[in-house]
């Protein structure tokens, strides 16, 4: 049978020929009668065999990392017969490892992100090196990791390559670190080979900065003419965090001004001071408010960095604006009796300059020929007034500053013209009637009524009488109905058309005013020839009768 030991050849041997071992048959008695042959990959080129002795040699430098074993076949032939002495056999040559490879980091580049202010021990990243040498051959591929750069902030676990934080870091002081890790084989013993890698560690932001006002005092101005909602200025706080950690909200401290408000512009992170209520320079010309600023959102664990909100004081100066005159009242109502003489007093209006300089005021009444106003605001009549023509005047009074005629205010003025009893009552219409020649005494021939152009505080009451002449010598009489009407009755029997065709009766109508006024009104009565039935036959002034609508046949 075949006789051999396991074959090993060290890699990287520089000699031209290196004896590996011997192949032999136990039938070989050493008389050189057998011939040994080597077949397979590497036979003749990498390995040779001494045909007589079976000694095997490596004739090339080998690299275990390229090929760690060779499988060859051996033959032994009897030279005399040419026949195989032993069956062909397979054997293995193993290439033994030497430490000829340094550790290599294959996953470069390494980059990691870790939150700032992370506690000691926080895992950052794991780096891994590989060594091409044989891990089963001593310590050639046993690695140890160490930190060449990155102390005191980082540490590396020697056997795993896990990088951890060893000291808190503040992004606002330094936002990235380059850490250099070395991997050594031979567990760091003498003769070890090493490789290095760089790790870029970036710090992500946490909300460990509160916003702080750059200025402890801001000075702003607002015009007293500014409407509510006006932006009067901006204030600015700074937060060195980034992104949403720097978002802030501005507000006014409690119990401060009700006149101003602060809103936050979330795009610019500015505070905009807004006028909440109109200001008046003459009432208050400066304000002081305290504004504060806080982050929009602070996680509970970071509240220790936000114990007290930053504040700033805002001094707001109100700018004086030349304001128009201000009337004491929003409108004025005066009363004046009609028929008062020209120049009579009506009333007094008053306007003042609300500004501190207190400009004198000039007054005018727009489009009025009936009233005058002087520089004191006293209104007088410029004509006699007649209530029966105009009972009310709707006017406009204008006040103008003497030193700035552009500053004008106008308000309504209402003047009521009060009634005096200056009109007597009179017939409500023109009365013309007739009486039949054959009329009997006491016959009603006309009902009359009166009107009075005057206004009555109580109801009008009229009194009807015949004039003195007609009372003493009258063919007619009058009865006052006590309801502002009266009836005319015949005071005799029979009338003669030829003798006396027309009667003119004077009727006195008096009112209940103080003093009472009386008017004389004429009632025309025509005498007509009437039939038995009382229908009109003939009247003088037939046309008139016809026009009066009397029936004729």
């Amino acid at each position: 049978g075949w006789v051999w030991n396991q074959f090993f050849v060290p890699e990287e041997m520089n000699t031209t020929s290196h004896h590996i071992g011997q192949l032999r048959s136990d039938l070989d008695n050493g008389n050189n009668s057998f011939q040994y042959k080597l077949l397979g990959a590497g036979a003749g080129s990498t390995f040779i065999i001494d045909e007589r002795t079976g000694d095997i040699y490596a004739i090339q430098k080998l690299d275990r990392e390229e090929r760690s074993l060779y499988i060859l076949r051996a033959q032994v032939i009897d030279i005399a017969t040419g026949r195989a002495v032993e069956p062909e056999s397979e054997f293995v040559i193993k290439v033994s490892d030497i430490n000829d490879n340094e550790p290599k980091f294959l996953d470069e580049p390494y980059e990691a992100i870790v939150p700032e202010m992370s506690p000691e021990g926080t895992l950052v990243i794991q780096v891994t090196a590989s060594d091409a040498d044989d891990p089963s051959s001593g310590n050639n591929a046993r690695l140890l990791y160490s930190l060449l750069q990155g102390q005191p902030y980082f540490s590396v676990e020697p056997t795993t390559g896990v990088i951890r934080i060893s000291s808190k870091m503040d992004r606002e002081l330094q936002d990235e670190y380059w850490v250099i890790i070395q991997a050594k084989d031979m567990i760091g013993q003498p003769g070890a080979l090493s490789g290095t890698t760089s790790v870029l560690i970036k710090l992500s932001d946490v909300n460990d900065n509160k916003p702080i006002f750059k200025e402890s005092l801001y000075r702003l101005t607002v015009s007293e003419s500014a409407p509510t909602g006006t932006s009067i200025g901006t204030i600015m706080a700074y937060d060195n965090d980034i992104g949403e950690n720097a978002e802030m909200d501005y507000s006014i401290e409690e119990d401060d001004s009700q006149t101003f408000d602060i809103i936050t512009n979330h795009e610019t992170q500015e505070g905009i001071v807004i006028l909440k209520k109109k200001v008046d320079f003459e009432h208050q010309n400066h304000y002081g408010i305290r504004a504060k600023v806080k982050n929009h959102h602070v996680p509970e664990q970071l509240m220790k960095y936000h114990t007290e909100a930053s504040t700033t004081f805002i001094k707001i100066q109100v700018e004086d604006v030349d304001e128009p005159p201000l009337f004491l009242l929003p409108y004025y109502v005066f009363e004046v009796f009609e028929e008062t003489p020209q120049g009579s007093f009506v009333g007094v209006v008053s306007a003042t300059d609300p500004d501190n300089r207190k400009s004198p005021i000039r007054y005018s009444i727009t489009r009025s020929k009936v009233f005058n106003i002087n520089d004191n605001g006293t209104i007088t009549t410029s004509n006699s007034l007649d209530r029966e023509i105009s009972a009310w005047y709707n006017l406009s009074i204008t006040a103008t500053e003497k030193y700035n005629i552009e500053q004008i205010s106008s308000i309504p003025l209402y003047v009521q013209v009060l009634n005096i009893n200056d009109h007597a009552p009179e017939f409500s219409q023109y009365y013309e009637t007739y009486v039949c020649e054959n009329a009997g005494s006491g016959q009603v021939i006309q009902t009359i009524s009166a009107v009075d152009r005057d206004e009555s505080i109580e109801e009008h009451h009229f009194y009807f009488n015949l004039s003195v002449e007609d009372t003493n010598n009258s063919s007619f009489t009058i009865i006052d109905n006590q309801d502002n009407t009266a009836v005319i009755l015949t005071n005799r029997t029979g009338f003669n058309l030829q003798e006396e065709p027309v009667f003119y009766i004077s009727i006195l109508i008096a009112d209940n005013g103080i003093p009472s006024l009386t008017s004389t009104n004429t009632l025309t009565i025509h005498v007509c020839d009437c039939g038995d039935s009382g229908s009109t036959q003939t009247c003088q002034y037939q046309e008139l009768v016809l026009s009066m609508g009397f029936k004729t046949e």
């Epitope: 992004r171 606002e172 460990d208 900065n209 702080i212 402890s216 960095y305 114990t307 504040t311």
Partner: antibody
């Protein structure tokens, strides 16, 4: 290592001028704002002036305003303090100091993390 | 703007030392603290009220509320004997307190 070294101190008469320098090494000088701080003999620290990382903004204590000028030359990694109209009360050790905080941060929240050894200025007749 | 500190504070070794710094509405601002030993330059020990710069032991701590900021040194050691200054920022200017001399008895 990170280092600041002041120079230029000395004895000067009242009304005179002096220029202090501060040489920086071991860090990216152009990324940091810089301060000058002084300390009168037996007294406390007094802030003098500050300059932004790029020199675009400068701030001064009221006591030195219009007399002292802070400047920097980033190509030479050097900070300067030009002092004129010097008074007896300007006598002090002058320190340059680095403002902690990356570019983009505002304010002096993070203190002065690197100081020079100081240079002595004596104003005396 | 003014920051007021007590001129001196004494503490026994191993005890807790508290140094105060007062100013109007100081709690709304951020405060830094510096340590200065005789003949040396100042060193930043606390910034932004309560944060530690690299290399500063955690026995130094800070707080800030109302009108007062406080630097607390727990387990005070002889090496902590120094002058301590508070510093704040107001309207683009830096303000230092007058300084407090900490004596470790």
């Amino acid at each position: 290592q990170v280092q600041l070294v002041e120079s230029g101190g000395g004895v000067v008469q009242p009304g005179g001028s002096l220029r202090l320098s501060c040489a920086a090494s071991g860090f990216t000088f152009s990324s940091y704002g810089m301060h000058w701080v002084r300390q009168a003999p037996g007294k406390g620290l007094e802030w003098v002036a500050f300059i932004w990382y790029d020199g675009s903004n400068k701030y001064y204590a009221d006591s030195v305003k219009d007399r002292f000028t802070i400047s920097r030359d980033n190509s030479k990694n050097t900070l300067y303090l030009q002092m004129k109209s010097l008074r007896a009360e300007d006598t002090a050790v002058y320190y340059c100091a680095r403002r902690a905080g990356i570019i983009g941060t505002i304010g002096y929240y993070y203190g002065m993390d690197v100081w020079g050894q100081g240079t002595t200025v004596t104003v005396s007749s | 703007y003014e920051l007021t500190q007590p001129p001196s504070v004494s503490v026994s070794p191993g005890q807790t030392a508290s140094i105060t710094c007062s100013g109007d509405r100081l709690g709304e601002k951020y405060v830094s603290w510096y340590q200065q030993k005789p003949g040396q330059s100042p060193i930043l020990v606390i910034y932004q009220d309560n944060k530690w710069p690299s290399g500063i032991p955690e026995r130094f701590s800070g707080s800030n509320s109302g009108n007062t900021a406080t630097l607390t040194i727990s387990g005070t050691q002889a090496m902590d004997e120094a002058d301590y200054y508070c510093q704040a920022w107001d309207s683009s200017t830096v303000v230092f307190g007058g300084g407090t001399k900490l004596t470790v008895l």
